[in-house]
Interface confidence: low
């Protein structure tokens, strides 16, 4: 019997926190050898499958979902699953996305203090939380 | 029009002090963070220093080039920045940006003010 | 601190040609990567922001690619205006570093 595979992550490029009519990635990580990534709505009513996996480091693969330019249709929580191997995955932790006009005039541009961040968004600032590693993708509100 | 006018530049000793003041304009100054950027005679871009906003405690940050010497600080009141730069060193010499970002890229700069330590 | 390594630092090209130029970090930085030019005496001016995002105005011709630690720039159909200074920033952490600069030349 096969163990349990890996739940996937998720995170949103450059951030979680959009403007209308920008441009944003949510991207899904798992294993290597992953077949096809999902992402879904927190309902199921949609979702999108890509077969379009690149290795994004020796023990992790990751599917890439760009949005071009946002609406409020796209705001909302977002989780991730993959196939490997015939079996589906379990899912991810949900990502919320957030869809607010800011005219660029806001102090955090990632997100707002109470969100959580993924992965590839900005860590604290290293001169103020000198034990935070640069991979641990603290909420931006540390740094700006 | 975001319109960012940086005043205060000069000729100054080694050891020296300055204060650069930013009138900003056209834009709701207080709930943006603000940066100083530095270039040298003929060289790259240094970031200098940084602001966040009332929100966020004026929370300061800066190049380790400067630490210790350059201070940050605004007036939110005036939309004015500043940045006070003592004990300065020859290699402070360059042209100093007041920049304002934009989802945090520094997207409005300033037409900058000369800086020059010398003997 | 996260260095940006530029590449070329010098690069020379016609009128019409496209180039690209680009732009290592030392650690991931996802897309926090913003691409300006800066024409001789003036202040710099951002034409890519989040990796991949035209900023406000700036012409088409202008395309930015990349995430992570490799990122690149590309001029398409280069124009006269284009040859100037052109500079990568990561804005992932403070400091908030630059790379070291491109020059364009007309050949």
């Known amino acids: 019997q096969e163990g349990p595979l890996p739940r996937p992550s998720i995170s949103a490029e450059p951030g979680t926190v959009i403007p209308p009519g920008r441009p944003v990635t949510i991207v899904c990580r798992g294993p290597v050898g992953v077949d096809q990534f999902r992402l879904e709505r927190e309902d199921r009513s949609k979702f999108n499958d890509t077969k379009d996996v690149s290795q994004a480091s020796p023990s992790e693969s990751e599917a890439r979902f760009r949005i071009d330019s946002v609406s409020e249709g796209n705001a909302g929580h977002y989780r991730c699953l993959y196939v490997k191997s015939t079996r589906w995955s379990e899912h991810s932790d949900y990502l919320d996305l957030v869809v607010k006009e800011t005219s660029g005039d806001t102090d955090s541009p990632v997100t707002e203090p109470d969100s959580s961040a993924g992965p590839t968004q900005r860590p604290s600032d290293n001169s103020h939380n000198e034990h935070a590693p640069a991979s641990q993708g603290l909420s931006a509100e540390h740094l700006y | 029009e975001v319109q960012l006018v940086e005043t205060g530049g000069g000729l100054v000793q080694p050891k020296g002090s300055l204060k650069l003041s930013c009138a900003a304009s056209?834009?709701?100054?207080?709930?943006?963070?603000m940066n100083w950027v530095r270039q040298a005679p003929g060289k790259g871009l240094e970031w200098v220093a940084r602001?966040?906003?009332?929100?966020?405690?004026?929370?300061?940050f800066y190049a380790d080039s400067v630490k210790d010497r350059f201070t940050i600080s605004r007036d939110d009141s005036q939309s004015m920045l500043y940045l006070q730069m003592n004990n300065l060193k020859t290699d402070d010499t360059a042209m100093y940006y007041c920049?304002?970002?934009?989802?945090?890229?520094?997207?409005?700069w300033g037409q900058g003010t000369p800086v020059t330590v010398s003997a | 601190d996260i260095q940006m390594t530029q590449s070329p630092a010098s690069q020379s090209a016609s009128l019409g040609e496209s180039v690209t130029i680009t732009c290592l970090a030392s650690?991931?930085?996802?897309?926090?990567l913003g691409w300006y030019r800066q024409k001789p005496g003036k202040s710099p001016q951002l034409l890519i922001y989040?990796?991949?995002s035209l900023a406000d105005g700036v012409p088409s011709r202008f395309s930015g690619s990349g995430s992570g630690t490799k990122f690149s720039f590309k001029i398409s159909s280069l124009q006269a205006e284009d040859f100037v200074i052109y500079y990568c920033?990561?804005?992932?952490?403070?400091?908030?570093?630059f790379g070291s600069g491109t020059k364009l030349e007309i050949k």
């Open positions: 920049v304002r970002d934009r989802a945090g890229f520094f997207a409005y």
């Open positions: 056209g834009f709701t100054f207080n709930i943006n963070a």
């Open positions: 602001i966040r906003t009332k929100n966020n405690n004026y929370a300061t």
């Open positions: 650690q991931t930085i996802g897309t926090w």
């Open positions: 989040a990796a991949t």
């Open positions: 920033q990561q804005l992932y952490s403070t400091p908030l570093t």
